[in-house]
């Protein structure tokens, strides 16, 4: 039987919730304009989109989506409308070697592009188990992928 | 839309070996994984194992671990579980289902009535 | 393995009726990472294969209708049906999607009056 490893239980203690605890502002080098910020959410959801499909082999079927799953978004006042992306970094960070694909590595540099924080990044590890891993990764990335999409519609 | 078609009924000699086929259709076979249920007559559902079909990475629950071989064929989105070595406890109704990862199992065939008798 | 015990085994409801079904697991379903509960409600009916009714403990399935609720968290969940129809008659499982096997209830069988 799979036991679920304790690293990914605590594991930043999920996804999106902890941006607003993670975030300590002590002003950024250099603020990004609203219009970059945008232009990097659009392109954001673009790619998301393509490194799902990537992963699904081409998927066309409509995925499941709970529209209760924790916004990406933070609501934080310095930086409205901006994505939560010192939550979602550690994550992508986490499953990118697996995916083997430049999307990924892109999405984590336009991400970091979004980090203003200074904040200790936690580490999140991948599940030791095969079906685990495949299930922890699909949950990011549909995840990711649903709640841009979500806030685009 | 989604369909798992399955043979409705197979008739085996006890001792033989069976083959259960279960033809996905209507979406990507890869991207989801093929679990196996069990149903006797008048009985509850058990799981048997499952297997992914874009690598055919496998787990089966150990009470059929000797029972049951799972396998597919990508070319035809094809599932097949073999049962060997069958007894009449083997008769039963076996249902292939559709696993999405994330949330649940969330399609299943019509099942294939297994009888097994002399 | 998780053990999915579910109850009462069976009963009897008039039509029009209020249904609440249990179903316990041995262990807490709720997978950290998105927050959710690795749990799902199947309803069979006669000479039927089992059909998706709830999964994620609470999200219905498109499709099913708004009569039946999904609840509960950890280790103890409940289905509910707010108002029987005859079309409800079936044997209702569930089914932990935590870790393999996937196991499932013995089931409730809902009989009409």
């Known amino acids: 039987m799979v036991s679920h490893i304790g690293s990914t239980r605590f594991a930043l203690f999920l996804l999106c919730c902890l941006g607003t605890l993670m975030f300590s502002h002590t002003g950024p080098i250099y603020q990004l304009q609203p219009k970059e910020i945008q232009a990097i959410i659009v392109e954001l959801q673009n790619l998301s989109k393509k490194l799902l499909d990537d992963y699904l082999n081409k998927e066309k079927g409509v995925q499941k989506f709970d529209s209760d799953l924790p916004s990406c978004f933070t609501s934080d006042s310095q930086a409205p409308g901006n994505i939560n992306s010192s939550a979602i970094l550690p994550y992508f960070k986490a499953i990118s070697p697996s995916l083997n694909n430049d999307k990924s590595l892109y999405i984590i540099e336009q991400l970091d592009k979004l980090n203003f924080q200074n904040a200790p990044e936690t580490e999140v590890s991948m599940p030791t188990d095969n079906f685990e891993r495949k299930r922890f990764i699909l949950t990011i990335l549909r995840w990711f992928s649903n709640c841009l999409e979500h806030r685009a519609q | 839309q989604v369909q798992l078609q399955q043979p409705g009924a197979e008739l085996v000699r006890p001792g033989a070996s069976v083959k259960l086929s279960c033809k996905a259709s209507?979406?990507?076979?890869?991207?989801?994984?093929m679990n196996w249920a069990k149903q006797r007559p008048g009985q509850g559902l058990e799981w048997i194992g499952m297997?992914?079909?874009?690598?055919?990475?496998?787990h089966y629950n150990q009470v059929f671990k000797d029972k049951a071989t799972l396998t597919v064929d990508k070319s035809s989105s094809t599932a097949y579980m073999q049962l060997s070595s069958l007894t009449s406890e083997d008769s039963a109704v076996y249902y292939c289902?559709?696993?999405?990862?994330?949330?649940?199992?969330?399609?299943w065939g019509q099942g294939t009535t297994l009888t097994v008798s002399s | 393995d998780i053990v999915m015990s579910q109850s009462p085994s069976s009963l009897a409801v008039s039509v029009g009726e209020k249904v609440t079904m249990s179903c316990k697991s041995s262990?807490?379903?709720?997978?950290?990472?998105?927050?959710?509960?690795?749990l799902a409600w199947f309803q069979q009916k006669p000479g039927q294969s089992p059909k998706l009714l709830i999964y994620?403990?609470?999200t219905r399935e498109s499709g099913v209708p708004a009569r039946f609720t999904g609840s509960g968290s950890g280790t103890d969940f409940t289905l509910t049906i707010s108002s029987v129809k005859t079309e409800d008659l079936a044997v209702y499982y569930c089914?932990?999607?935590?870790?393999?096997?996937?196991?499932f209830g013995s089931g409730t069988k809902l009989e009409i009056k």
């Open positions: 297997i992914d079909p874009s690598d055919s990475e496998i």
């Open positions: 289902a559709r696993q999405d990862i994330v949330t649940t199992v969330d399609y």
């Open positions: 089914q932990q999607g935590y870790t393999y096997p996937f196991t």
């Open positions: 209507g979406y990507t076979f890869t991207s989801y994984w």
């Open positions: 994620w403990a609470s």
């Open positions: 262990q807490s379903l709720l997978y950290s990472i998105n927050q959710k509960n690795h």
